[in-house]
Each structure stands twice: as C-alpha cells, then as structure tokens.
C-alpha cells in the first residue's frame, strides 16, 4: 500500500523537515530558515514561532519542530502554549488591578500565581484547627473537638465571601 501511495503521490516520500516543492517537479526541498515541518508529506513548511519581549525561548525551532516559548523570570505563562505572560507575586499575595496585594485575613495563597483562597473551615468536617492559617498557608485541621481534652479551644474564623482576583488591566 505504501509503495502504491508513493507512486500516486510523490510528496508522501518527503520526510519531516522538508516540503514537497511544486515549483521543482515535486522534489523534497529542505524547510527554509525559520520554518519547520513536523510530519512527512507536507507541501509547505510552517513559520516558526518567535519568542520576544516578555517571552523567552524554551526550545529553539528546528527543521522538524516548532519553537516553544515561556515567560521571562518574574512572570508565568497563561493559556495553552504560553500565549500570554502574567507577573508573579509572592506567596501570600494575589495579583489585582493595582498590582500584588497581600491576602486578606482568612485567606491564603501558597503559590506565586492565582488568587487568595479561604482557609479550610475545619468545623465543617467536625474537626478543630491544629495549626493556624497564615497568608501563605492553609490551616491544618486536627482531631474533632470531642477528641480534645476539656477546655481546648477550636475556634475557626469564618471564611470571608470574596471576589476572585483580577489580572492588571
């Protein structure tokens, strides 16, 4: 079957990294600089992605594979394939329209990206707070209050209702 297909379509013989050149009797020509073909039998090569500015090159373009970009230090990727870069914040912060802001009391963020999330409400699971939460860390829930010695406290502050964080606009 492969041989039959080759006889019918000479382009099917062109490997990745080349294209079937209609201008030259359908011979296989190498992809020009800054282009690639990742599969065989292609009639054109695709332009390489360019990583500039806030993007940096994670993987160089080759004749058989596209370039891959990520973000420069201090930024993280958004979108599949890193189509946008967003500023990092510190742990215990979130990115708002006005820049990086500390998490409100009762919320935390243990990453450099994303929004501050409410501490776990241990009492909802019938447990008590073993370790208090901080801006950077969630509370650690321990045994249920009934398991504690008399007089032990298990006050969990209510998680405030809040809007999701915003990227700067």
């Amino acid at each position: 079957f492969e041989r039959t297909r080759s006889l019918q379509d000479p382009c099917s013989n062109c490997p990745a990294g080349t294209f079937c050149d209609n201008n030259r009797n359908q011979i296989c020509s190498p992809c020009p600089p800054n282009s690639f073909s990742s599969a065989g039998g292609q009639r054109t090569c695709d332009i390489c992605r360019q990583c500039k500015g806030v993007f940096r090159t994670r993987k160089e373009c080759s004749s058989t594979s596209n370039a891959e970009c990520d973000c420069t230090p201090g930024f993280h990727c958004l979108g599949a394939g890193c189509s946008m870069c967003e500023q990092d914040c510190k742990q215990g912060q979130e990115l708002t329209k006005k820049g990086c802001k500390d998490c409100c009391f009762g919320t935390f963020n243990d990453q450099k990206r994303g929004i501050c999330r409410p501490w776990t409400n241990c009492s909802l699971d019938g447990k008590s707070v073993l370790v208090n939460g901080t801006k950077e860390r969630d509370v650690v829930c321990g045994p249920s209050p009934a398991d504690l010695s008399p007089g032990a406290s298990s006050v969990t502050p209510p998680a405030p209702a809040r809007e999701p964080g915003h990227s700067p606009q």
Partner: antibody
Framework: QVQLQESGPGLVKPSETLSLTCTVS????????VHWIRQPPGKGLEWIGA???????DYNAAFISRVTISVDTSKNQFSLKLSSVTAADTAVYYC?????????WGQGTLVTVSS | DIQMTQSPSSLSASVGDRVTITCKAS??????VSWYQQKPGKAPKLLIY???NRYTGVPSRFSGSGSGTDFTLTISSLQPEDFATYYC?????????FGQGTRLEIK
Amino acid sequence: QVQLQESGPGLVKPSETLSLTCTVSGFSLTTYGVHWIRQPPGKGLEWIGAIWSGGSTDYNAAFISRVTISVDTSKNQFSLKLSSVTAADTAVYYCARDDGSFANWGQGTLVTVSS
Amino acid sequence: DIQMTQSPSSLSASVGDRVTITCKASENVGTYVSWYQQKPGKAPKLLIYGASNRYTGVPSRFSGSGSGTDFTLTISSLQPEDFATYYCGQTYSYPLTFGQGTRLEIK
C-alpha cells in the same frame, strides 16, 4: 493601577518628524516593554514596533528606515519617532504594554499630517 | 508577513442574537490569536487570548475557538453594549498583524 498615556503634537507637517511619548505608571519599565500600534481614521490596526525591557527594539519592516523607539526610565517614558511623514501617517497612535496579548493600552493620540 | 482576514467586514444583528465572526490567517499561527473589542474614540480592549481564553472580567457570552489558520469569535447573546468593532490579531510571529475589523451594528 497600570496606566499608559500617549502625548505629543496633534499636527505635524509633511516631511517632518512625528514625536510621541508614552508615559506609564503602575509597572516598571525595566520589567515590561512597550509596543506602538497605529490606526488610520476608519481603518484597522497596524503594528509599528516594540522596545523590550532590556532596551532592544523590533520594528515592522514597513517603517524600519524611519522609525526609532526608545525609553527614558528616569521619566517613566517610552518614545516613538517617525521621520519623513506624509498624509498616510495620519492616525491614532497607541502604546500598549508587552504581555504577549496587549491587555493594557493607552487611550491613543490622534496625529494629523498636514501643511 | 502573516495576513489576517476577517469576515464579515460588517454585520447587523439584534439584541439577544448569536453572532460569529471569523478570522483566517495566511499561515499556521497555532493558537496565538487574540480578539479585541473597540468602541468609537476608545482603545481596543482584550477579550480573548490564546484563541480561546477569556481575559479577566470579560463576560462569558464571549468565546473564542480555532487553531492553525481558522479562528472564530462568538457572542452567544448580544447585549446593547456589544455593538462595536472587533479585531483579531496574531501574536505568533513578527511583525504582529491584525485583521481589518468587523463592525457590529444594531439591526
């Protein structure tokens, strides 16, 4: 809050040099670059060029012989210079922060080229 | 340069309608396409990045799809504030290029 604001003369004579500034606040010029994009009246958007956070530049080949983009970090300003202007350069000129997808733009400034 | 061709160039629709705008790239640009909304006298506003990601604060009635050379912006139920001009743009390769725009008018 991230803000960009273009400013400069609204009227430039043919053959002269168009000079615009983009004053920014809410972000560091050493962290982000800026793009310049223009829009002739009633037409689409055209990318002119960009200056990256390290100070290097990239220009659209259509403008390369007459465009210069620079930065003055002490004034929190980027600048665009376009020489030998003609009526075809009449447009609203925008600066936009470099984040990969143009999430933050200035309000734009109209430049008319006329004698 | 990569050409971005939008269609239609203008479109009349009513509040509540579902509207689709298409953008065709002259080369494969992966998913590196953004969509912008522009109202008269204002700067463009980012709606969609990476072909399908809604930017912060953009209503869920706006959605984007596509990859390679064919892309669409869909507004599921038009609101009065959606009447504007929409542009696609590719952020894949330099020079960055934009479509010629689609003007969305009230029928």
